[in-house]
């Protein structure tokens, strides 16, 4: 293109992109009609006064990933049409006052991933049209009152990955149009009452990875439009009874990685839109009746890696839409036969890594759609007659790492397993633990002549007499067993506007390698 600086490329006459280490100053002359200018990965260290004076039609300016550490106050003079400005990924420590003066059209300002140590009210006082402000990944230790008071149209504010230790309750009070507020990965220990009261249009609040210990009871009471609330990886030890009472739009709530010891009935809700609840990696010891009963649309409930030893029979009341229930890596020894009775739509349950000694015969009685059951690494010696018989969709059952007692009482279970071998997977098969002479042998193919007759009174219903060698013609064709529906890996909290981290922690879900993809 005629007019395109020699060290730049122009994919269109009005769109200039200048990249490369050989560039040490803003290229000149720039085309007078330039609408976008990108200066990326250069060795520019400073912006002088008015380097863009002759390109007043500029709409978008990206100066990213440079060595930029110093900007003169008048660097952006005469850019009254500028709507998008990014100074991200540079080495800025200080912003001159008045830098953004005259940028009357500015809508998006990206200052992320610099080394800014402070911002002042005067920095943004001229930016009345600003809708998005990204300040994440800097070294901010505090936000002064009034810093955002003039940004009444702001809809997104990202302050994540800074060094904030406290927030003034007045700092967000004028941001009535704010929809997204991100404060993740700071050093916040508490949030003063009233901090979010002015944010009546807030849809997402990201507070994960701080050091928050206590939540004020009415902290979210004015945020009726909140849809996503991230509180994970903090130090929260208890939830005030009314903390979530006025969040009818909430559809995602993360509380994993805290210090919660108990959940009181009614703590969640009413939240008719909540689809997922993440509570793994806490210190929960028991689940009382009706603790989740307001969550009528919940589909995913993750309670793994806690210390749950008791689940009340009505703990899961109301969860008629639940698809996934993760209870693995807890301290469960016994389960009431009715505990899962209300979970008519449950598809996947993980109970591995507990201390379950036995299961009631009716434990899965009403859960006809179960597709995967994880029971490995418990204390199971046998299972009740017919416990899985009605589960026509069951395609994955994990039973290994249990101390199976291979006396004659085990034969019905063995025969069922023989018929349903494809459902057990190929990774690890259940093996006998006792008697000693068959220890380590596969439960499915134990030698009949070695097995010892039962001499104890069984704790489970007695089985009808079953042949040692079932008719092999009734083996299901392994190709017809549908593989389990792949569980979605849990999506971690947002870390910034451009990245979502996906946890690869299969132990949270209790997934096998094959399932997790």
């Amino acid at each position: 293109y005629y007019g395109c600086p020699s060290e730049c490329t122009c994919s269109r006459a009005s769109q200039v992109e200048c990249t490369g280490a050989r560039i040490v100053a803003v290229p000149t002359p720039l085309p007078w009609n330039a609408m976008s200018l990108q200066i990326l990965n250069t060795h520019i260290t400073e912006l002088s006064e008015s380097p863009f004076l002759n390109i007043s039609a500029l709409i978008a300016l990206r100066i990213e990933k440079n060595e930029l550490s110093h900007i003169m106050p008048g660097a952006f003079r005469n850019l009254g049409s500028l709507r998008y400005l990014s100074l991200a990924n540079n080495k800025l420590q200080v912003l001159p006052i008045g830098l953004f003066q005259g940028l009357d059209s500015l809508e998006s300002l990206l200052l992320s991933s610099n080394q800014l140590v402070q911002i002042q009210p005067a920095h943004f006082s001229q930016c009345s049209n600003l809708k998005e402000l990204q300040l994440h990944g800097n070294h901010l230790e505090y936000i002064p009152d009034g810093a955002f008071d003039h940004l009444v149209g702001l809809t997104k504010l990202n302050l994540g990955k800074n060094s904030l230790t406290h927030i003034s309750p007045r700092v967000f009070q004028h941001l009535g149009n704010l929809q997204v507020l991100r404060l993740y990965e700071n050093r916040l220990t508490d949030i003063p009452m009233g901090t979010f009261d002015g944010l009546v249009n807030l849809q997402e609040l990201a507070l994960q990875q701080n050091q928050i210990g206590l939540l004020s009871p009415g902290l979210f009471h004015n945020n009726h439009n909140l849809q996503r609330l991230y509180l994970s990886n903090n130090h929260i030890s208890q939830l005030p009874p009314s903390i979530f009472m006025q969040l009818p739009q909430l559809n995602r709530l993360t509380l994993f990685g805290n210090s919660l010891k108990e959940l009181s009935p009614g703590i969640f809700g009413p939240m008719p839109n909540l689809r997922e609840l993440w509570l793994y990696d806490n210190h929960i010891t028991s689940l009382p009746d009706n603790v989740f009963s307001n969550l009528r649309q919940l589909q995913v409930l993750i309670l793994s890696r806690n210390q749950i030893s008791f689940i009340s029979p009505g703990a899961f009341n109301g969860l008629t839409e639940l698809r996934e229930l993760s209870l693995h890596t807890n301290a469960l020894q016994d389960l009431d036969g009715n505990v899962f009775r209300m979970l008519a739509n449950l598809q996947n349950i993980s109970l591995q890594n507990n201390r379950l000694r036995q299961l009631p015969g009716n434990i899965f009685a009403n859960v006809n759609g179960l597709m995967t059951i994880q029971l490995q690494n418990n204390q199971l010696e046998n299972l009740p007659l017919g416990i899985f018989d009605h589960l026509g969709k069951l395609c994955e059952l994990r039973l290994y790492d249990n101390p199976w007692r291979c006396d004659s009482d085990i034969l019905p279970l063995r025969n069922w397993l023989l018929l349903n071998q494809p459902r057990l997977g190929t990774d690890t098969v259940p093996v006998c633990f006792s008697p000693a002479n068959v220890r380590g042998q596969s439960l499915i193919i134990i030698n009949v002549n070695v097995a010892v007759p039962s001499v104890h009174v069984p704790e489970v219903p007695s089985y009808p007499e079953t042949s040692w060698y079932p008719d092999t013609s009734s083996y299901p064709d392994t190709t017809s067993i549908s593989s389990t529906t792949e569980l979605t890996s849990p999506v971690e909290d947002y870390t910034d506007l451009t990245t979502i981290q996906v946890t690869d922690d299969r132990s949270v879900w209790g997934m096998t390698q094959a399932q997790s993809g």
Partner: antibody, heavy 120, light 110 residues
Framework: QVQLVQSGAEVKKPGSSVKVSCKAS????????ISWVRQAPGQGLEWMGG????????NYAQKFQGRVTITADESTSTAYMELSSLRSEDTAVYYC?????????????WGQGTLVTVSS | QSALTQPASVSGSPGQSITISCTGT?????????VSWYQQHPGKAPKLMIY???NRPSGVSNRFSGSKSGNTASLTISGLQAEDEADYYC??????????FGGGTKLTVL
């Protein structure tokens, strides 16, 4: 090669909302404008608005202001167009389109289109 | 943001040349050299044929050319071929940083 793949056809009731997705592959997603253009049956093309994903804020045609919301998820390279308060005249094929520069003054790449039918 | 004005239809015989006009205002066509032309076959997505008034993307035949005078842009197709039969749309950048299309022209190859 840049590809834009859109979500499937939708049938909606008047007064409801529809959200159409557009997944981009084969090139940088964040630093190019994604625009949405619709075409009613037998009618011409109509620009609805656009977004530069890295900058987050969308620009809308006056006609659709307040009724359309365009968003982008950089982590999945997906843009979305949500149209609310649907009426029968919103029945159309909705296209996402992308240019070759930060600001789209023209559109080199188009999605396959998503038919949205609004009917009671 | 009124649509740019195009003739509803034009026609021509194979081998002939045709021109499609696109009239706007000083706020769009007349104010910027950012006029584009698209070809659309039935049931298909539009295809960019001309950008910035007169530039052709790679792969587009040199039988297609564009020009502009004042508030009116034009698309000329020379050596008309059967496969050129389609709808053609002009598009311009506007003063309020948005985009406006023409109403479309149906080209019939006789």
């Amino acid at each position: 090669q840049v590809q834009l793949v859109q979500s499937g056809a939708e049938v909606k009731k008047p007064g409801s909302s529809v959200k159409v997705s557009c997944k981009a592959s084969g090139g940088t997603f964040s630093s190019y404008t994604i625009s949405w253009v619709r075409q009613a049956p037998g009618q011409g093309l109509e620009w609805m608005g656009g977004i530069i994903p890295m900058f987050g804020t969308a620009n809308y045609a006056q006609k659709f202001q307040g009724r359309v919301t365009i968003t982008a998820d950089e982590s999945t390279s997906t843009a979305y167009m949500e149209l609310s308060s649907l009426r029968s005249e919103d029945t159309a094929v909705y296209y996402c389109a992308r240019g070759v520069a930060l600001l789209a003054t023209d559109f080199d790449y188009w999605g396959q289109g998503t038919l949205v039918t609004v009917s009671s | 943001q009124s649509a740019l004005t195009q003739p509803a239809s034009v026609s021509g015989s194979p081998g002939q040349s045709i021109t499609i006009s696109c009239t706007g205002t000083s706020s769009d066509v007349g104010g910027y050299n950012y006029v584009s032309w698209y070809q659309q076959h039935p049931g298909k997505a539009p295809k960019l044929m001309i950008y910035e008034v007169s530039n052709r993307p790679s792969g587009v035949s040199n039988r297609f050319s564009g020009s502009k005078s004042g508030n009116t842009a034009s698309l000329t197709i020379s050596g008309l071929q059967a496969e050129d039969e389609a709808d053609y749309y002009c598009q311009s950048w506007t003063h309020d940083n948005s985009v406006v299309f023409g109403g479309g022209t149906k080209l019939t190859v006789l």
